[in-house]
């Protein structure tokens, strides 16, 4: 009975730049298969303690498991499987329809290194010329995951991507966010000057990269065909993206109700909690479903906008339909209409 506890079990983690994290694929008698996160009776949304995958991490010569669950972006190769029975058992698996399969992601602790892994790539002289082309998102101010300036590396060459506002590149941006395991494209980040002055005190690894790229094919389906090398521009805009997988997300809570599953919606910006103001772009229940889910309550029972007769009522405003799409909250200093939400209480 094959399981991930067996000594001859073979696994690999794909779709990432590290052998210690990625989409879980296993080798069964007829080749490599992607494992669906709906396996072993789990839902594609909810997974439990990742320590049950310790043996997989060990086999890959990585450290302990950090997280196990649905991979943010599902890439479906020829063969994906759903397995049944005990967690980690591969004796009873069936081929899954690709459109039904959400792949299973696993992150293990990187093996011990002298210095911590950085969130920037190594200097451009390091990669071997044979290294596959890869992308990196460099956070602009203090570090936001899945948001920042796009850098493209091909062999030993790396640099930013020159971008003109009139470029029609929606397909490309979705492809890039997807490739970075960051979900789908949300928006361009505010204009960033490629030729900004270098702070002499800035550490060496944060200095501008020696080359620049231009978009060559905005409908490309593999990285090597997307960009061409150009002379670095002294000024101009570089491609900076916000993808749907960005972190940290806006946190919400419900206050003033009779349980944690009802109340006026508040959101947190930094250390401050403030009322979330009603937004005409979020009149459907989608926003409130998400808020209820974050409180670990059931689905939305009702929501109502409270009258904002008070011109001094203040709060925070999210221009998107869902809070999870909100990269930044805007302050509203008057006529903030609060929203009272009632979610189903799982423990009435």
């Amino acid at each position: 009975r094959l399981s991930w506890y067996d000594p001859d079990f073979q696994a690999r983690l794909t779709r990432s730049n590290s052998k210690c994290q990625g989409q879980l694929e296993v080798y069964l008698k007829d080749g490599w298969h992607m494992v669906c996160s709906q396996s072993w009776g789990r839902s594609s949304k909810q997974w439990e303690d990742p320590s049950q995958a310790s043996k997989v991490c060990q086999r890959l010569n990585c450290g302990v498991p950090l997280s196990l669950g649905p991979f943010l972006v599902t890439y479906t190769p020829q063969s994906s499987i759903i397995c049944y029975g005990q967690l980690g058992s591969f004796s009873n698996c069936s081929h899954s329809r690709n459109d039904m399969c959400h792949s299973l992601g696993l992150t293990c602790l990187e093996p011990q290194k002298t210095t911590p892994p950085t969130t920037r790539p190594p200097p451009t002289t390091t990669p071997e010329p044979t290294a596959p082309p890869r992308l990196q998102l460099v956070a602009q101010s203090g570090g936001q995951h899945c948001a920042g300036v796009v850098e493209f590396y091909s062999g030993s060459l790396g640099g930013t991507i020159s971008y003109e506002a009139q470029d029609k590149t929606q397909d490309l941006e979705n492809f890039l966010c997807n490739n970075l395991q960051c979900g789908s494209f949300l928006k361009h980040l505010p204009e960033t000057e490629a030729g900004r002055a270098q702070d002499p005190g800035e550490p060496r690894e944060h200095q501008p990269l020696p080359i620049q790229w231009k978009i060559q094919n905005s409908s490309c389906t593999s990285l090597e065909h997307c960009f061409r090398k150009i002379k670095p521009q002294k000024s101009g805009r570089v491609l900076a993206l916000l993808c749907s997988g960005f972190q940290p997300k806006v946190q919400s809570r419900l206050v003033g109700g009779s349980s944690i599953c009802e109340g006026t919606v508040e959101v947190r910006q930094g250390a401050q909690w403030a009322a979330l103001c009603d937004s005409s772009s979020a009149r459907s229940s989608l926003r409130w479903e998400e808020v209820c889910r974050e409180q670990q309550c059931g689905s939305v029972n009702s929501y109502r906008v409270l009258d904002a007769g008070d011109p001094t009522s203040r709060g925070l405003f999210c221009p998107h339909q869902k809070l999870s799409q909100c990269h930044e909250l805007w302050e509203r200093n008057s006529y903030c209409k609060k929203v009272f939400v009632t979610c189903q209480d799982p423990n009435p």
């Epitope: 990625g22 303690d49 940290p248 997300k249 930094g270």
Partner: nanobody, 119 residues
Framework: QVQLVESGGGLVQPGGSVRLSCATS????????MGWYRQAPGKEREFVAL???????HYADSVKGRFIISRENAKTTVYLQMNGLKPEDTAVYYC?????????????WGQGTQVTVSS
């Protein structure tokens, strides 16, 4: 923005205790993992402990039974309670957070806080 600020280090006697804190700026979903590493002078940085979003923990063998990692309910602050300290625990202690979804996480590090165990 993801910024980590450690505090609570200092000079402590052998056998003594100290509690390190690490606060993250911004609000972060609870699916993250937080942990501590340390680096003693002239040595490699080594893993100390981690705590996952669901609350499960893992420790390096050298600190098991002496150190306790915990996090507050809001999931944005992690603590390392260090008891029964030994001179070999002297090091700079670094806080780390892993953000993202399973299989696609990025790590972010604090600046470090010095702990010196000496009589």
């Amino acid at each position: 923005q993801v910024q980590l600020v450690e505090s609570g280090g200092g000079l402590v006697q052998p056998g003594g205790s100290v509690r390190l804190s690490c606060a993250t700026s911004g609000s972060i979903f609870s699916t993250n993992v937080m942990g501590w590493y340390r680096q003693a002078p002239g040595k490699e940085r080594e893993f100390v402990a981690l705590i996952r979003g669901g609350g499960s923990t893992h420790y390096a063998d050298s600190v098991k039974g002496r150190f306790i990692i915990s996090r507050e309910n809001a999931k944005t602050t992690v603590y390392l309670q260090m008891n029964g300290l030994k001179p070999e625990d002297t090091a700079v202690y670094y806080c780390v957070i892993w953000l993202g979804s399973p299989g696609a996480m990025s790590d972010y590090w604090g600046q470090g806080t010095q702990v010196t165990v000496s009589s």
